[in-house]
Amino acid sequence: VPLSRTVRCTCISISNQPVNPRSLEKLEIIPASQFCPRVEIIATMKKKGEKRCLNPESKAIKNLLKAVSKEMSKRSP
């Protein structure tokens, strides 16, 4: 969800910190659009429901995305 009607991109700051997939409530990958010209990855944490902006270029975050997509492919029939 954008921060407001006037601000284009949500992630003012981004994090390189590794995220434990088990601590994730939700992972949103927002593709680049006419509003925000870059991909944004927003992780909603189970604890406190805090939303974190993740660095799409970070090795740790790329590994997280791989782990999550692997988990999703296991679950899908």
Epitope: L3, S4, R5, T6, V7, R8, C9, T10, C11, I12, S13, I14, S15, N16, P37, R38, I42, E50, K51, R52, C53, N55
Partner: antibody, heavy 120, light 108 residues
Framework: QEQLVESGGNVVQPGRSLRLSCAAS????????MHWVRQAPGKGLEWVAV????????YYADSVKDRFTVSKDNSKNTLYLQMNSLRAEDTAVYYC?????????????WGQGTMVTVSS | EIVLTQSPAILSLSPGERATLSCRAS??????LAWYQQKPGQAPRLLIY???NRATGIPARFSGSGSGTDFTLTISSLEPEDFAVYYC??????????FGGGTKVEIK
């Protein structure tokens, strides 16, 4: 430790220009968006400007729009505020502040401030 | 522009007492509200973001609550170092980001 240090404050005449700097250390500057916030003597806090972590997006308070420009040099770990056409009402302590590393807008690390006085 | 009104302007209390500070928004800001503490001659310090999340290193005696237009910062038991000015700040529908006028918590 994580630190922000502002510099460049001075006494200037109305209509003149000034550039403030904010040197960051102890954290990965290139992943943080940054703000300028000011405080007139004896008054409350006023947000001035923001710049995204990669410098792509910038927004300003109406009171400084078209006069002030925020920029960020990630290779030098430094934030800047170019202030043109200064007015008496710009007199304040100017703080640089780091945006928190969550999908929110809040200032989790502040500099000590630098005083700008606009007076003839 | 969203206007934040803080009350009371001055709160006179003794150490050990409970402090309740109010911040009211001119329109709904959802949970997009932060609280800061500022001592004389110092920069502000982030206490609470997103209405109720304590910032790193902030003691548990500080808590935030509320959503929409009415918010509260509670200090459960005032310590001597808690006497300061407190500001609320919103980020709904920004720019601009706006701050309240502040509440000064002073020693009775």
């Amino acid at each position: 430790q994580e630190q922000l240090v502002e510099s460049g404050g001075n006494v200037v005449q109305p209509g003149r220009s000034l550039r403030l700097s904010c040197a960051a250390s102890g954290f990965t500057f290139s992943t943080y968006g940054m703000h300028w916030v000011r405080q007139a003597p004896g008054k409350g806090l006023e947000w001035v400007a923001v710049i995204w972590y990669d410098g792509s997006d910038k927004y300003y308070a109406d009171s400084v729009k078209d006069r002030f420009t925020v920029s960020k040099d990630n290779s030098k770990n430094t934030l800047y505020l170019q202030m043109n056409s200064l007015r008496a009402e710009d007199t304040a302590v100017y703080y640089c502040a780091r945006n928190i590393a969550v999908a929110d807008v809040a200032f989790d690390l502040w500099g000590q401030g630098t005083m700008v006085t606009v007076s003839s | 522009e969203i206007v934040l009104t803080q009350s009371p302007a001055i709160l006179s209390l003794s150490p050990g007492e409970r402090a309740t500070l109010s911040c009211r928004a001119s329109q709904s800001v959802s949970s997009y509200l932060a609280w800061y503490q500022q001592k004389p001659g110092q920069a502000p310090r982030l206490l609470i973001y997103d209405a109720s999340n304590r910032a790193t290193g902030i003691p548990a005696r500080f808590s935030g609550s509320g959503s929409g237009t009415d918010f509260t910062l509670t200090i459960s038991s005032l310590e001597p170092e808690d006497f300061a000015v407190y500001y609320c700040q919103q980020r709904s529908n920004w720019p601009p980001l706006t701050f309240g006028g502040g509440t000064k918590v002073e020693i009775k």
